[in-house]
Interface confidence: low
């Protein structure tokens, strides 16, 4: 049976020896999981199954990606006649891809007697542990080293059946059972020294392709019993066709129209409907630093810019909590969006003995640094005495005003005697509702804010009984000279609503470092950005005019077409195979000879590193 492409895939389990329910329950669970299954994506765990269990439904399994665990069962035969490969991507007990133990009943004759894995010829990672199976025969006749790929893998086979029949004479002492059909197939230890993997005969020209797993019927990558890495439409390949390939005309990685995705060990044109694409693999869910997006009808995982979006329930009307307090503060960890409102009342900050709520640790207010949006209102009527601004909300961009406080307020700040500035440096929109800022006796800077610029409608402001504007000016509590006339949220160039000249990572500056300074920059509008690290710093001149490695005046290392690169392409995937280049005397990347397979030091065939292909073997990759 050579590799095909359509296979029934099922999930494995990760329960180990912890099992719930009785033997019948176990059997039903196994049946539901593995009926008609061909590839177990995960571990095949058969534990505590009874003596009368008909396990013939396991016969279709050809591959297990994780480990096989068979423990504390009473059935006599484990029928896995088609199991070719155990990949060992997960191993049991830290090192075993096959773990078979304690398969007998001390009070009866029920026991595992035969492990008929007659097709098993490959364990890609991990070792073998078969111990204390009272009636299990022939395990010590198997040449496990022929099956296990890893030379250093541990193989423990002991204390199994003692009065066992011999192997049939045709098996030459290697068998899974007593019959002539039970012989072990050797595909490694019998091979000629020229074969670096497995073989289909003893001759030097009877080696399997290096991408085969478990053996083969011929020398090609389409002749494999199973694939060491991935199966691409019946051919075993080291990688599925990648999402990006090197375009020799643009000197860039570009989308590959023939891309395929890794689904287990198979390359597929599209992932199953309940999977998403992460880089070049099909995964059940995106990792924690990525979020699911849909692009051209394809569900994929994309890295989040900073924290991944996380919406959290707020406080106030329609919520479980009246105020932020010590009982709920931890629920706001990593929240980027508050669905509803945030209320800070004295009972929250100082605690509420009637409800057995302790005082809030002011340090914990830093959880709000991740919040970018509040859909309802922000109501601050109590604030820790030693905190002089609301900088924990320095990343808050939008107050939605979908729900409003009291007489229609979306931002309410009152009676916070120690607050000297608002510090809401990222706030750019108050979508609806009124702004109410009163009776904050030391509060300055708020008169400078162009509130109209923040509001979608005419700003309805009630700002009074804070520190008088004239007094603030006398005390020098005015906007930094680098701020524009739009005003500021507090002192210094990081609190401006917008900048008079340029801005660098949210801080207003006189100018970008265009021609001087250790780190050189370019400007996009009025924002300064660092040049690409592959740009060489030009003394007294412009180092780059954009963010890309193709905008450098000079390269720090090498140039590949228009792009500055840290090294010339070495084996990067092109349209017709890997591309290798070398740097010439002017540090330009030049193509190696078309037959070089490991890079080169110059353009000629004799400049190739390692072995070069004979001329007829490789389609030329002309750059």
């Amino acid at each position: 049976s050579e590799v095909g492409n359509s296979q029934a895939v099922c999930p494995g389990t990760l329960n180990g020896l912890s099992v719930t329910g009785d033997a019948e329950n176990q059997y039903q669970t196994l049946y539901k999981l593995y009926e008609r299954c061909e590839v177990v994506m995960g571990n095949l765990e058969i534990v505590l199954t009874g003596h009368n269990a008909d396990l013939s439904f396991l016969q279709w399994i050809r591959e297990v990606t994780g480990y096989v665990l068979v423990a504390m069962n009473e059935f006599s035969t484990l029928p896995l006649p088609n199991l070719r490969v155990v990949r060992g991507t997960q191993v049991y007990d830290g090192k075993f891809a096959i773990f078979v133990m304690l398969n007998y009943n001390t009070n009866s004759s029920h026991a595992l007697r035969q492990l008929r894995l007659t097709q098993l010829t490959e364990i890609l990672s991990g070792g073998v542990y078969i111990e204390k199976n009272d009636k299990l025969c022939h395990m010590d006749t198997i040449d496990w080293r022929d099956i296990v790929r890893d030379r250093d893998a541990e193989i423990v086979v002991k204390d199994n059946g003692r009065s066992c029949p011999p192997c049939h004479e045709v098996c030459k002492g290697r068998c899974w059972g007593p019959g002539s059909e039970d012989c072990q197939t050797l595909t490694k230890t019998i091979c000629a020294p020229q074969c670096n993997g497995r073989c289909f005969g003893r001759a030097p020209n009877e080696c399997c392709h290096e991408e085969c797993a478990g053996g083969c019927t011929g020398p090609l990558q389409t002749h494999c019993f199973a694939c060491r890495h991935f199966n691409d439409s019946g051919a075993c390949v080291p990688l599925c066709p990648q999402p990006l390939i090197y375009n020799k005309l643009t000197f860039q990685l570009e989308p590959n129209p023939d891309t395929k995705y890794q689904y287990g060990s198979v390359c597929v044109r599209s992932c199953p409907h309940n999977f998403v694409v992460d880089q070049s693999s099909c995964v059940r869910a995106c990792p924690s630093n990525k979020m699911e997006v849909e692009k051209n009808g394809l569900k994929m995982c994309e890295p989040c810019a900073g924290l991944c979006p996380k919406a959290c329930e707020g406080t106030g009307a329609g919520s479980h909590y009246q105020t932020v307090d010590s009982s709920n503060i931890d629920s706001f960890v990593n929240c980027t969006k508050i669905l509803g409102n945030l209320d800070f009342l004295i009972t929250g900050l100082e605690g509420d003995p009637w409800r057995n709520i302790s005082a809030l640790d002011p340090e914990k207010l830093n959880v709000f640094r991740t919040v970018r949006e509040i859909t309802g209102y922000l109501n601050i009527q109590s604030w820790p005495k030693h905190m002089h601004n609301f900088s924990v909300f320095s990343n808050l961009e939008t107050i939605g005003g979908r729900s409003l406080y009291n007489r229609g307020f979306s931002l309410l700040i009152m009676k916070n005697d120690n607050v000297t500035s608002l510090g809401l440096r990222s706030l750019r929109e108050v979508s609806a509702g009124r702004v109410y800022i009163t009776e904050n006796r030391r509060l300055c800077y708020l008169h400078t804010v162009q509130w109209a610029a923040l509001s979608r409608r005419r700003a309805d402001l009630d700002i009074r009984n804070n520190k008088p504007r004239g007094k603030c000016q006398q005390e020098g509590k005015v906007c930094d000279p680098l701020c524009s006339a739009d005003g500021c949220w507090g002192p210094g160039p990081a609190q401006c609503l917008s900048c008079r000249h340029y801005s660098r990572r949210g801080v207003c500056v006189e100018s970008c470092s265009f021609t001087q300074g250790e780190t050189r920059e370019f400007a996009e509008g009025t924002e300064c950005f660092e040049c690409h690290p592959e740009c060489e710093r030009v003394e007294g001149g412009i180092t780059c005019n954009g963010s890309g490695a193709d905008t450098c005046t000079r390269c720090a290392h090498y140039r590949d077409g228009p792009h500055c690169v840290e090294r010339c392409p070495e084996g990067i995937l092109g349209e017709r195979g890997p591309i290798y280049k070398y740097p010439d005397s002017s540090r330009e990347c030049r193509p190696c000879h078309e037959n070089c397979t490991r890079g080169c030091t110059g353009p000629l065939l004799q400049d190739c590193l390692g072995d070069a292909l004979p001329s007829a073997r490789r389609a030329p990759t002309v750059i």
């Epitope: 660098r504 990572r505 250790e518 780190t519 660092e530 690290p533 710093r537 720090a556 290392h557």
Partner: nanobody, 115 residues
Framework: EVQLVESGGGLVQPGGSLRLSCVAS?????SYWMYWVRQAPGKGVEW??????????RYTDSVKGRFTISRDNAKNTLYLQMNSLKSEDTAMYYC?????????ESQGTQVTVSS
């Protein structure tokens, strides 16, 4: 004179973690892009990670999601937090400024990942 002194290397099992540090002197550390590079036995120098003066991070594909670069400009120190280490991460690790990596400016620290 530019000096870069790495520390924190050692022997660790696959899946383990190490934190490398590099103390810099002799130049305005806070103004430079800083790099971690590595050289495995018998191989060329390989770029691992970079960080800009303002903290913009970059990683080579093989370490993305496992390694984290950071810096403390006040202490003139560069760090590399290495998690989920693999045997292929075994190498001499050097910190470097944005210059040619062919000849590292420092002694390096050895990281060996082995069971």
């Amino acid at each position: 004179e530019v000096q870069l002194v790495e520390s924190g290397g050692g022997l660790v099992q696959p899946g383990g973690s190490l934190r490398l540090s590099c103390v810099a002197s002799g130049f305005t550390f806070s103004s430079y892009w800083m790099y971690w590079v590595r050289q495995a036995p018998g191989k060329g120098v390989e770029w691992v990670s970079a960080i800009s003066p303002g903290g913009v991070e970059r990683y080579t594909d093989s370490v993305k999601g496992r390694f984290t670069i950071s810096r403390d400009n006040a202490k003139n120190t560069l760090y590399l937090q290495m998690n989920s280490l693999k045997s292929e991460d075994t190498a001499m690790y050097y910190c470097a400024r944005l210059t040619s990596f062919a000849t590292p400016e420092s002694q390096g620290t050895q990281v060996t990942v082995s069971s």
